[in-house]
């Protein structure tokens, strides 16, 4: 991760002691079933939980340098319908693949600005970021 | 949402200032799919994305008004296998209703000390925090 | 009447590539899930994966590292690979058709069968 | 996998007397949604290819004589000749298509007593 400028710092106070972006050790955010890989539309019988699911998808990298988390993952449907808990390789058009949307907390740089409009280092804006977490097997919906 | 102290105000810098919260109008943080009350293990034909999954969830509030995001929710699975496409009701053992995880970037405030050891307000820590996002049919896994 | 036949060497190397392929005629290749399976002389019957018309595989995990599948709707026919053969892949091969069941959306068992050939492993 | 096991492995029975031959598999193949037990019994006679008998346990195959009947669920299955005939000296397999890897039991021979 690159190294942000500090939240507004007052004098004799730097950066890493004002906010601490590596108290713990930070691996790169990637979920742990990451897998650029499974491309098919099938449920695998071993691998990480997108491969194995029976509504199976990849993640996309979504990456910004003025946002924290810099890096996040979109998932991305495999297949239309979901894969038949039968085979794991044939399709069953009575489930439908779905994706599952999270509005996400995140963390945007911009310049601060002092009361003579001058400029102060960055102060963090938060905001909701729409992330797509997962596809999900559902029924579909009945129009009523 | 409570309003927290500045991250380590600089003098003359209101907290609003240093890091805005409210920039964007912040709804409570919870799913677009929350259902509270979809308990049985089935398949719904309308509702929320967790309640027509043929591997429904619910979720559980966890707060902490130490963090950000203040409100989070876990998954939690209602069924042990997947639910009949068929029927939406009864179960098909050939699939397992799996969490999945993610590691979510949060904050905790906790107290900025100075050289000598003074208060000087609240810093954000970065952790990571295990979430379950959703529950997923997925095809057991075969032992090699 | 959908009837397949199934054509190839009658003898491979141990270590070389068994190579097969089965024939459907009486029927189109399309919209059905076919199989080959193996058997020993004088034992049982083992699957070995199945194919869908438009390359969909499903292999046995016991065979996954050494098979592959493949079809050719053009012939209507599919085929099999399996490589790095030993003594112990002696065997009659049996190209078969699934049935399919369009209420559940699964396969059924297999309805009609090829005669099967012998496939012998020297060393 | 799910195992299928046979018993007996062999039997010999007086023309036109009852065959019963019990298939056994590792897990239940009944699946509660469609209320479909997903076994298949085949016939094979020396030099031939499988034939198919019955499916969904219990259904006959067009053709198939109906001295031939399937019974049972979950995981204990019959297959039964009731008077058996001469062209019925042959192997017979069950086999599950409940979940892949598809498998088969390891037959049991047909003689006449």
């Known amino acids: 991760y690159s190294h942000w400028p500090s939240c507004c710092p007052s004098k004799g106070y730097p950066s890493e002691e004002l906010l601490r972006w590596s108290t713990v050790p930070v691996p790169p955010l990637k979920p742990a079933s990451l897998d650029f890989h499974s491309v098919s539309c099938r449920a695998s019988e071993d691998g990480p939980l997108n491969s194995r699911a029976i509504s199976p998808w990849r993640y996309e990298l979504d990456r910004d340098l003025n946002r924290l988390p810099q890096d996040l993952y979109h998932a991305r449907c495999l297949c239309p319908h979901c894969v038949s808990l039968q085979t794991g390789s044939h399709m069953d058009p009575r489930g439908n693949s779905e994706l599952l949307y999270h509005n996400q907390t995140v963390f945007y740089r911009r310049p601060c600005h002092g009361k003579k409009g001058n400029h102060k280092g960055y102060c963090l804006e938060r905001r909701l970021y729409r992330v797509s977490l997962a596809c999900v097997c559902v029924r579909p919906r009945v129009m009523g | 949402y409570s309003h927290w102290p500045s991250c380590c105000p600089s003098k003359g810098y209101p907290s609003e200032e240093l890091l805005r919260w409210s920039t964007v109008p912040v709804p409570p943080l919870k799913p677009a799919s929350l259902d509270f009350h979809s308990v049985s293990c089935r398949a719904s034909e309308d509702g929320p994305l967790n309640s027509r999954a043929i591997s429904p969830w619910r979720y559980e509030l966890d707060r902490d008004l130490n963090r950000l995001p203040q409100d989070l929710y876990h998954a939690r699975c209602l069924c042990p296998h997947c639910v009949s496409l068929q029927t939406g009701s009864h179960m098909d053992p050939r699939g397992n209703s799996e969490l999945l995880y993610h590691n979510q970037t949060v904050f905790y405030r906790r107290p900025c000390h100075g050289k000598k050891g003074n208060h000087k307000g609240y810093c954000l820590e970065r952790r990571l925090y295990r979430v379950s996002l959703a529950c997923v049919c997925v095809r057991p896994r075969v032992m090699g | 009447q959908v009837q397949l036949q199934e054509s190839g060497p009658g003898l491979v190397k141990s270590s070389e590539t068994l190579s097969l392929t089965c024939t459907v005629s009486g029927g189109s290749i399309s919209s059905y899930y076919w199989s080959w399976i193996r058997q020993p002389p004088g034992k049982g019957l083992e699957w070995i994966g199945f194919i869908y018309y438009s390359g969909s595989t499903n292999y046995n995990p016991s065979l996954k590292s050494r098979v592959t599948f493949s079809v050719d709707t053009s012939k209507n026919h599919f085929s099999l690979k399996l490589n790095s053969v030993t003594a112990t892949d002696t065997a009659v091969y049996y190209c078969?058709?699934?049935?399919?069941?369009?209420?559940?959306?699964?396969?059924?068992?297999?309805?009609?069968w090829g005669q099967g050939t012998l496939v012998t492993v020297s060393s | 996998d799910i195992v299928m096991t046979q018993s007996p492995d062999s039997l010999a029975v007086s023309l036109g007397e009852r065959a019963t031959i019990n298939c056994k598999s590792s897990q239940n193949i009944l699946l509660t949604s469609s209320n479909k037990n997903y076994l298949t019994w085949y016939q094979q006679k020396p030099g031939q290819p499988p034939k198919l008998l019955i499916y969904w346990a219990s259904i006959r195959e067009s053709g198939v004589p109906d001295r031939f009947s399937g019974s049972g669920s979950g995981t204990d299955f019959t297959l039964t000749i009731s008077s058996l005939q001469a062209e019925d000296v042959a192997l017979y397999f069950c086999?599950?298509?409940?979940?892949?890897?598809?498998?088969f039991g390891p037959g049991t021979k047909v003689d006449i007593k």
């Open positions: 078969a058709r699934h049935y399919f069941d369009s209420g559940t959306y699964e396969l059924g068992p297999f309805d009609y």
């Open positions: 086999q599950q298509y409940y979940i892949t890897p598809f498998t």
